[in-house]
Interface confidence: medium
């Protein structure tokens, strides 16, 4: 969690002199309660916006907007504390709007916004706006919270942001899987335009259970420049047990921008239906998995011939 660095943070508006300050998330009014405190924010909205840094990078940001209630408590409103909590890490970042002048009633409802919290793809946040000073112990709460889920890197608008591109979002491996004779599976995918190694991970399951009955990892060495955008092939020898037939294949790149944390592309090949006419139909998914898996490191580029089913995936 961080603040976008590309411009001075502003909260002043006509009729209000205001400054944005870093906050420890523990306002002084917790420690020294006041007798008169303002009411809570109204109509808190959090939206996904995108913002450029001075360097030209594009980041997803949380756009936070709220209004004030039209009651006399605005006369005691000294500012607001904005808190963003990343739910999976419990990391919290706060800023404080400090009013340098007193709010007056005017014809239009007071509205505030802030668009400088940089958020991460696929993460969920709790956004809270506290009006200051905070209430006395046992007083009515004067904050509002909303949870905010940021789309992941598969979303078209997220794909082109700097954090997504850094994790390989623009690479489309177009994975295909062929089932060959002699208990073999050939995986083919398109290499990206970077001289970087890849891992292809196969995990097999029985149709009836979720437990893995077979797994193997193969390495693909960093391609040369003339091999960029070419197809790479890896052939796996499958488990000898016919019931160990539900295969999950992942291709994990190790791009320089994301190393072990690159987005993996995955394909699932279900067990064949016992029928002469049915071709197993794999289901493609796209899942960010953040820890690499260890395994055997033999690489085989095979041209085995055999009756095959072709499956095309993203």
């Amino acid at each position: 969690l961080r603040l976008l660095d590309h411009r001075a943070l502003v909260c002043s508006q006509p009729g209000l002199n205001c400054t944005v300050k870093n906050s420890t998330c523990l306002d002084d009014s917790w420690i020294h309660p006041r007798n008169l405190t303002p009411s809570s924010p109204k109509d808190l909205q959090i939206q996904l916006h995108f913002a450029h840094t001075q360097q030209g990078d594009l980041f997803p940001v949380a756009h936070i907007e709220w209004t004030l209630q039209t009651d006399a408590s605005i006369l005691y409103l000294e500012g607001a504390e904005l808190s963003v909590l990343q739910l999976n890490t419990n990391e919290r970042l706060c800023v404080k709007f400090q009013f340098l002048s007193m709010l007056q009633h005017h014809r239009k409802r007071w509205r505030f916004s802030f668009s400088h919290f940089v958020v991460d793809p696929g993460q969920e946040y709790e956004v809270t706006v506290h009006h200051l000073p905070k209430p006395i112990p046992d007083g009515d709460p004067n904050h509002q919270s909303k949870n905010f889920l940021v789309p992941d890197c598969e979303h078209a608008r997220m794909k082109v942001t700097t954090p997504c591109m850094s994790s390989g979002s623009l690479w489309d491996p177009n994975i295909t899987v062929e089932t060959l004779e002699a208990h073999q599976l050939r995986v083919s995918f398109t290499l990206w335009n970077e001289s970087t190694p890849y891992q292809v991970l196969l995990e097999s399951f029985s149709d009836s259970e979720n437990h893995s009955c077979f797994d193997v990892v193969k390495q693909i060495f960093a391609p040369r420049q003339e091999e960029f955008h070419q197809r790479a092939n890896v052939t796996f020898t499958l488990s000898k047990f016919h019931w160990c037939c539900h295969h999950h294949v992942q291709v994990q790149p190790f791009f320089s921008s994301c190393l072990n944390d690159c987005l993996r592309h995955a394909v699932t090949v279900p067990c064949p239906v016992i029928s002469n006419t049915t071709v197993p139909k794999p289901v493609a998914d796209y899942i960010p998995l953040w820890e690499p898996r260890s395994g055997s490191s033999d690489y085989k580029d095979d041209d085995d011939k055999g009756s095959s089913h072709h499956h095309h995936h993203h």
Epitope: L48, F50, A156
Partner: antibody, heavy 131, light 107 residues
């Protein structure tokens, strides 16, 4: 109610540059993506590209070398320039907004916002490329 | 590019009929798909977004379903004003791509 209006010359000579402007009324151009789409009898509906209000652009790779999309937030307008036109660029050109930010409310105060496609369209303007 | 195909390319139906149009994507697009109706000389109008959500102001006889690669638009009881051309649009990947359209005319 947001409305979009395309404007620009209806006739362009081959090899020249096609220039169109889309004016947004009834709402702000800020915080949305804005698209250009064209429709020709031979090719159906074709997405040309889009621009975010901050100036970030995405183009259709098939047209990228010839397309420039720009935005003028002060005028609530965005524009399309297509260079080196041929008769194949004859089409009805539409501008469109990339969806309202959707908010899905689950239990309590849960929110999920994202862009979900083109919801508001201009009425279209016909551009003929001919000498 | 993601190729969108639609079937049928045209169909003839009567008022009151149930009509189903299918759209297929060449690769998985989750639910990043919209359905549009276009009448001659008019701009496309969105009926369905996110594959199955009804656009505000659109009659409930229109519904959408599907996810991944296969999507369906259903008109439960065709009305005279529904005779038009229907397009699907994927907005999962750049470039966004439309289906070739399905023309619904009067039998």
């Amino acid at each position: 109610q947001v409305q979009l209006q395309e404007s620009g010359p209806g006739l362009v000579k081959p090899s020249e540059t096609l220039s169109l402007t889309c004016t947004v009324s009834g709402g702000s151009i800020s915080n949305y993506y804005w698209n250009w789409i064209r429709q020709s009898p031979g090719k159906g509906l074709e997405w040309i590209g889009d621009i975010y209000y901050s100036g970030s652009t995405n183009y259709n790779p098939s047209l990228k070398s010839r397309v420039t999309i720009s935005v003028d937030t002060s005028k609530n307008q965005f524009s399309l320039k297509l260079s080196s036109v041929t008769t194949a660029d004859t089409a009805v050109y539409y501008c469109a907004r990339d969806g309202e930010l959707a908010n899905y409310y689950g239990s309590g105060s849960y929110q999920f916002y994202y862009y979900y496609g083109m919801d508001v369209w201009g009425q279209g303007t016909t551009v003929t490329v001919s000498s | 590019d993601i190729l969108m195909t639609q079937s049928p390319s045209s169909l003839s139906a009567s008022v009151g009929d149930r009509v189903t149009i299918t759209c297929r994507a060449s690769q998985g697009i989750r639910n990043d798909l919209g359905w549009y109706q276009q009448k001659p000389g008019k701009a496309p109008k969105r009926l369905i977004y996110a594959a199955s959500s009804l656009q505000s102001g659109v009659p409930s006889r229109f519904s959408g379903s599907g996810s991944g690669t296969e999507f369906t638009l259903t008109i439960s009881s065709l009305q005279p004003e529904d005779f038009a051309t229907y397009y699907c649009l994927q907005h999962n990947s750049n470039p966004f791509t439309f289906g070739p359209g399905t023309k619904v005319d009067i039998k």
